[in-house]
Structures are given as structure tokens and as C-alpha cells.
């Protein structure tokens, strides 16, 4: 699904990092891990040290303050989770620093973070009907729902 064209004039300004070094586990209790330099995948781990640790940065929209928009970075790196298209793996994009302002096509770096109880959802700002998701025998990708798993638990203070 193509990004919504009206998003191009919405500007997102970086606020601050709101979470450091957390792990994302899906509903099957699989942790997100590095598949290779570019992609992520999910696996059941005995040792959580192998799981990817993420930082979460918050952005404010010029359009509306009430919605929580975030960027996901692999801790202690300059790699950022970047959305592609539906059923395509999310990419790890290297950037020298966290973007101070994001607009237009760069919104593929941003996600709406929604919590409900222990469930966390990350909807792509560029593709508002698609979530960060895990899929059996596949990379972490963007998906609209089942059979992909779109809800995650955040595990904090693992360091």
C-alpha cells in the first residue's frame, strides 16, 4: 500500500529518547534478533542477551500532539528500523544521528506506538494500516494482521 499522500506536509520533531535498551517479545514469546546486517527476525531464546536491545525516541507532530509517534533504534548503534511495503521486511537503516525533523518520505522511520495492557503495537506512519510484525520462518516485516503477529511485549531493564 502506498504511503498516504497527505502525510507529506506533516512535520515530526524529535523530543527525546524515552526508553533505552528494551527487548521486544511477540505473542509467541519470541524475541526479536538480528538476522543479518539488514534484517531482523524472531526466535525463542533461552538467553535474552542474544535479543536485540532497542531505544525508543519520541516525536511530536505539527498536526496533532495526542498521538505517540516514535522511532526505533538498535541500542548502541546508528541503525534505525525502517518500514518498506506490506509483507516486506523492515530494514535497518544507518544514519549518523537521530533525525531532528522528519517529514515526507522519511516517515517510513516513524511508528505510532499504541499500548493496551501488556500489548504494544507499532503502526507505520507511512503505511497507517500496517504494523511491525513477526511471521513464521520470515523476517520482521510490515503486516496488516494474522497470520503475522503484531502485538509485542516490552521487556525493560535487561542490561
Amino acid at each position: 500500500s502506498a504511503p498516504f499522500s497527505f502525510l507529506s506536509n506533516v512535520k515530526y520533531n524529535f523530543m527525546r529518547i524515552i526508553k533505552y535498551e528494551f527487548i521486544l517479545n511477540d505473542a509467541l514469546n519470541q524475541s526479536i534478533i538480528r538476522a543479518n546486517d539488514q534484517y531482523l527476525t524472531a526466535a525463542a531464546l533461552h538467553n535474552l542477551d542474544e535479543a536485540v536491545k532497542f531505544d525508543m525516541g519520541a516525536y511530536k507532530s505539527s498536526k496533532d500532539d495526542a498521538k505517540i509517534t516514535v522511532i526505533l533504534r538498535i541500542s548502541k548503534t546508528q541503525l534505525y528500523v525502517t518500514a518498506q511495503d506490506e509483507d516486506q521486511p523492515v530494514l535497518l537503516k544507518e544514519m549518523p544521528e537521530i533525525p531532528k525533523t522528519i517529514t515526507g518520505s522519511e516517515t517510513n522511520l516513524l511508528f505510532f506506538w499504541e499500548t493496551h495492557g501488556t500489548k504494544n503495537y507499532f503502526t507505520s506512519v507511512a503505511h497507517p494500516n500496517l504494523f511491525i510484525a513477526t511471521k513464521q520462518d520470515y523476517w520482521v516485516c510490515l503486516a496488516g494482521g494474522p497470520p503475522s503477529i503484531t502485538d509485542f511485549q516490552i521487556l525493560e531493564n535487561q542490561a
Epitope: 526508553k19 496533532d64 495526542a66 506506538w113 493496551h116 495492557g117 506512519v125 497507517p128
Partner: antibody
């Protein structure tokens, strides 16, 4: 699952303040918004204000802007709502709620009756 | 402020029949950037904590019987109980969480006819 336990009923004089606590057991407020809502006798629900602790941002209904203070302790397990310059019409049951980072209530406290009377 | 108006104020429905409660917002609660309606429905019974039934206008909360459903978009929303049970007697509230202040409807009292 988070359970919210609020402090007990209070009787206050007009002009005084009340501070109601809301303790989360089985979890913390870290990833959630906390909303405070009241219900006057025989009336509906009125949103007073709220806080998203991870942003350290509070939000208040205009009518309560100058009288309402909402805070969360450092452990992110107890939220507080303080209402000052109380008047008889502030007599109500005060509720806290949380469970999402949007301002709706998945988990609700049992309510705290605040009576303002001379 | 967004004003939430429920109708009717009270409703009497026979057991097993369908109950429909409407909620109208004075402005849209649909956030175009993520295509979601920021609307929730609650059930309030005397002496019990409030119970979230529906969020995002149509997502049923876990554990809520499937006879409860939410629908609508923009400014017009509906809570439907497909087959009324005795335990559904309560007051029902809609709430918008789109913009501050996050307002509630005045409530609809549901009784058995």
C-alpha cells in the same frame, strides 16, 4: 494485570485541598497514560485531567487548570490527584484509570468519595 | 471541546432482543494519519469498577462477550448488544480520546422491558 487501589473517602471543608492516591499493583504506569475522572451524585463521568509519565506531560480540563495537580511517584507505581480551593460542587467520586498510552481507561480504580461540606 | 451526545438517555429492551445506543461527537474523532477512531465504550454497574467494552470504536476488549459490538466512524458511533442478557443492565458511556479534554457522553441507562 494491573489493579488500581485508591485512597479512602475524604470529608473536606470548602476552600481546602484534597489529595487522592492511586496505587498500581501488578504493574507500573511506565507505558501508560493515567486519567482522572469524577462522577458527581446522580451525574455522568467528567474527565479532569491526566498524565503520561514517560513524557512527564500533564493535561487538564480547562475548568480545573488552576486547581488540579497530577503527579506520579518516581517508582511509577502511585499516581496522585490534588484538587485545591474545594467547593461543595466538587463533591463526587473520583476515579483513576490507566492501561493504554491513549487517554482511555482499561483498568479503573474503585473510586474515592470526596465530600465537601462546611 | 468535543461534545459527546448519547441517545437515548434511557432504553428498555426485552431479554434476547437487540439494544442499540448511539453516540455523536461534535467533531470528527477519526485521526487521518492512522485511520483510527479514538472512541471507547464503557459499562458502569452500581458498586463495580467501570468496564471497558470497546476501544478504537470497534475493537472488543478481551473477555467482553461477543454480543457487544461497536461500529461507526468520524462523528457517529453505535454500541450494539445483539441479544440482551439480564447482566447487561447498566449505564453505558462513550468517550472520545482524540483531543483534550477527553470528554464522555452523558450516559445511557439500559433496563429490561
Amino acid at each position: 494485570q494491573v489493579q488500581l487501589v485508591q485512597s479512602g473517602a475524604e470529608v473536606k471543608k470548602p476552600g481546602s485541598s484534597v489529595k487522592v492516591s492511586c496505587k498500581a499493583s501488578g504493574g507500573r504506569f511506565t507505558n501508560y497514560a493515567i486519567l482522572w475522572v469524577r462522577q458527581a451524585p446522580g451525574q455522568g463521568l467528567q474527565w479532569l485531567g491526566g498524565i503520561i509519565p514517560i513524557f512527564d506531560e500533564t493535561d487538564h480540563a480547562q475548568d480545573f487548570q488552576d486547581r488540579l495537580t497530577i503527579t506520579v511517584d518516581e517508582s511509577m507505581t502511585t499516581a496522585y490527584m490534588e484538587l485545591s480551593s474545594l467547593r461543595p460542587e466538587d463533591t463526587a467520586i473520583y476515579y483513576c484509570a490507566t492501561g493504554s498510552n491513549s487517554y482511555y481507561g482499561l483498568y479503573w480504580g474503585q473510586g474515592t468519595l470526596v465530600t465537601v461540606s462546611s | 471541546d468535543i461534545v459527546m451526545t448519547q441517545s437515548p438517555d434511557s432504553l428498555a429492551v426485552s431479554l434476547g432482543e437487540r439494544a442499540t445506543i448511539n453516540c455523536k461527537s461534535s467533531q470528527s474523532v477519526l485521526y487521518s494519519s492512522n485511520n483510527k477512531n479514538y472512541l471507547a465504550w464503557y459499562q458502569q454497574k452500581p458498586g463495580q469498577p467501570h468496564k471497558l467494552l470497546i476501544y478504537w470504536a470497534s475493537t472488543r476488549e478481551s473477555g467482553v462477550p461477543d454480543r457487544f459490538s461497536g461500529s461507526g466512524s468520524g462523528t457517529d458511533f453505535t454500541l450494539t448488544i445483539s441479544s440482551l442478557q439480564a447482566e447487561d443492565v447498566a449505564v453505558y458511556y462513550c468517550q472520545q480520546y482524540y483531543s483534550s479534554p477527553y470528554t464522555f457522553g452523558q450516559g445511557t441507562k439500559l433496563e429490561i422491558k
